[in-house]
């Protein structure tokens, strides 16, 4: 249904192969990426409440797809500047994280309930209480399956899991 206004291949914004996104815009995409859909000639990326598309062969498109596949984008994305200002990103940190079962959480309410019920005291990173938990507008078609919200995904709870103790050059703070 490429070209369809309501279909999963509808694009709110097309990015030309001649002018790839800036570093800042890529960081924004990484942070807010929720899903992607492979169309015939391009890939549609679903963000909070809008979409952006790029050619299937464009390097930035491949990078974003890989990023979501590996769960390094979207809700699992912490971001060096925006969300982790208390970290020193100058060298690979030696840190330790609380580990627990982070199931495919469906709603912010369930996410909160999960947090409260957790025996491992997961904590929220600085800045994570943002609008990231918004859902897309009802009239936007996404590839999300029934029963899943945009907050759901592999290791969606990972950005709730913060280190239990400080180690190395990057002392982490946690807010309960």
């Amino acid at each position: 249904n490429e070209g369809s206004v309501t279909g999963s291949c509808y694009c709110g914004k097309r990015i030309s192969s001649d002018s790839p996104p800036s570093v800042q815009f890529m960081n924004r995409l990484r942070k807010h990426l929720r899903a992607y859909h492979r169309c015939l000639y391009y890939t549609r990326f679903q963000l909070l409440s809008w979409s952006v598309c790029g050619g299937n062969k464009d390097p930035w498109v491949q990078e974003l797809m890989s990023c979501l596949d590996l769960k390094e984008c979207g809700h699992a994305y912490s971001g060096i500047v925006a969300h982790q200002k208390h970290l020193l990103p100058t060298s690979p940190p030696i840190s330790q994280a609380s580990e627990g079962a982070s199931s495919d959480i469906h709603t912010p309410a369930q996410m909160l309930l999960s947090t409260l019920q957790s025996t491992q005291r997961p904590t929220l990173p600085v800045g994570s209480l943002s609008s990231d938990k918004e859902l897309t507008r009802p009239n936007e078609t996404t590839i999300h399956t029934a029963g899943h919200s945009l907050a759901a995904g592999p290791e969606a709870g990972e950005n709730q899991k913060q280190p239990e103790k400080n180690a190395g050059p990057t002392a982490r703070t946690s807010a309960t």
């Epitope: 960081n27 797809m65 769960k71 699992a76 060096i80 690979p92 999300h144 399956t145 592999p154 990057t170």
Partner: antibody, heavy 118, light 113 residues
Framework: EVQLVESGGGLVKPGGSLRLSCAAS????????MNWVRQAPGKGLEWVAR??????????FYADSVKGRFTFSRDDSKNTLYLQMNSLKTEDTAVYYC?????????WGQGTTVTVSS | DIVMTQSPDSLAVSAGETVTINCKSS????????????LAWYQQKPGQSPKLLIY???TRQSGVPDRFSGSGSGTDFTLTISSVQAEDVAVYYC?????????FGGGTKVEIK
Amino acid sequence: EVQLVESGGGLVKPGGSLRLSCAASGFTFSNAVMNWVRQAPGKGLEWVARIRTKPNNYATFYADSVKGRFTFSRDDSKNTLYLQMNSLKTEDTAVYYCTAWTTEGIYWGQGTTVTVSS
Amino acid sequence: DIVMTQSPDSLAVSAGETVTINCKSSQSLLYSGNQKNYLAWYQQKPGQSPKLLIYWASTRQSGVPDRFSGSGSGTDFTLTISSVQAEDVAVYYCQQYYDTPWTFGGGTKVEIK
């Protein structure tokens, strides 16, 4: 060709330390999510630790059984992983594999053997 | 943690027969963000490291013979070895990488009669 080569294994007494290394080549190391998995003699596979990529501050995650004793780090400039293992226990005896998770699959090294015995 | 239940524990078949190994996860491994199932299948021969056969539940790794195939979605997955050969004698593991910690099935030992 993707290659992961572990080193640093050996025999150590309980309470001792070892540092494992894993040299990677053949793929974009900085984009890969790296893990350590171990296999005790005659047993199944057990995940040990994970380290994320630079955009996620190289965040690390550990199995409960090693938390507080093992430290996972990576050096993207050298395409190398490190697993510092302290306060080793006899139950840590296993073959340790480093793995690279990419969109093209999950690659494994040949493993390095760690034996903890008095 | 996601529990991976693999069956059978072992099986013995004649060369040329078809082998089916099942793997069930305690929660769905299908990610709505990309419609991919985060499940892999490995083959491990004695004294060797695990060899990736299948990833994303059904994508065959480069160099793996086409007699190996993976199927399934959500919580139920299958590895099929059609026309088993002598070199296929090994232990086969399923693994989920949907969530940390990664978890593995208990393994299925395949032998030739």
